[in-house]
Interface confidence: low
Amino acid sequence: AGIPEKAFNLTWISTDFKTILEWQPKPTNYTYTVQISDRSRNWKNKCFSTTDTECDLTDEIVKDVTWAYEAKVLSVPRRNSVHGDGDQLVIHGEEPPFTNAPKFLPYRDTNLGQPVIQQFEQDGRKLNVVVKDSLTLVRKNGTFLTLRQVFGKDLGYIITYRKGSSTGKKTNITNTNEFSIDVEEGVSYCFFVQAMIFSRKTNQNSPGSSTVCTEQWKSFLGE
């Protein structure tokens, strides 16, 4: 059967805590098993004896999003006698070839999903913009938490806006999901939002939302 090839290009793909570990190559005559260190630093087998080159580890990493998880991908010959005892995988008394993934700290490393502008509320010359607080896959007491519930005041939004007829843009940062500006009556304003995590040194910002203009909003509402 030959010696199994070690996995390479181990990459974490994670958005709003939905987290998948991907790697290469496609296996031939062997399978992969992923191990992840849990909150107690035990190795736990996931995606046991799979021929896939990805493994969904969301259920593990959402248990504590402030923990730095370690993971490894083991290459296991198909025809060997294998036994897994929960935290170890042994082939004829030897650990199979494996490759370590980079450490993954969900709070720091998960990408922020594209935010959605939920609504505009106008009160005279004040325009209030509300950004939808999207759900994550992090649970507490059986309920999925929102981004705001997970990140608290560490979550902010960069709101870029312009008058509909203007090319000049203004940018503001808020640490809530709402933002107010003074507007001129009868003028359309267009908004673009990015989520950000203040404490991060890299991977700080989300992709931008779709640009939404107040005139479009009125037509959405049938006004």
Epitope: R39, S40, R41, N42, W67, E70, P102, K201
Partner: antibody, heavy 118, light 104 residues
Framework: QVQLKESGPALVKPTQTLTLTCTFS??????????VGWIRQPPGKALEWLAL???????RYSTSLKTRLTISKDTSKNQVVLTMTNMDPVDTATYYC??????????WGQGTLVTVSS | DIELTQPPSVSVAPGQTARISCSGD??????AYWYQQKPGQAPVLVIY?????GIPERFSGSNSGNTATLTISGTQAEDEADYYC?????????FGGGTKLTVL
Amino acid sequence: QVQLKESGPALVKPTQTLTLTCTFSGLSLSTSGVGVGWIRQPPGKALEWLALIYSNDDKRYSTSLKTRLTISKDTSKNQVVLTMTNMDPVDTATYYCARYKQETIDYWGQGTLVTVSS
Amino acid sequence: DIELTQPPSVSVAPGQTARISCSGDNLGEKYAYWYQQKPGQAPVLVIYDDNNRGIPERFSGSNSGNTATLTISGTQAEDEADYYCQSYDIEITVFGGGTKLTVL
């Protein structure tokens, strides 16, 4: 108040086995993510990491010294023990035990000087 | 295993800013920690998780690319000490070789 104190022989002979004990208070080795590690420092030289044991008995060792090191814990006595076999004069150093919180070494013992000489 | 490289010595005049570097492959992808050690004493944590302070405000840290940097603003005579950076690789802890900070 977290406190750690190292104890063991001040002098060992070459080829002998060194046994060091770290006795700690103010920390629980049954808390997830907490560990106790050993670091040494030869006179006038840099810090060198040796070994680490976490609350769940997960053990980690220096790549270059792992064949000579054994770390264990006795939670009931609030102690962590390090043994190092086949001691050599180059192992003369101050040996520190320290408290880990994930990767952060936030509390250190005062250190104990071990001299290896015949 | 990752290797961390520090300059053996750095000198600074009192009141000036001292910067001590620590380099290692892709160090910015990991967290860096800094310890201060005075003669005859155990090390003391000064910076953890790149830029969180363990002791006085004049100490700060940064970490990106291949280099972590400890910055001491308004250096005082009492800051004269050896400084060690630390990071980790899979399942191991790694220290730099240490930098002796001399306050002139």
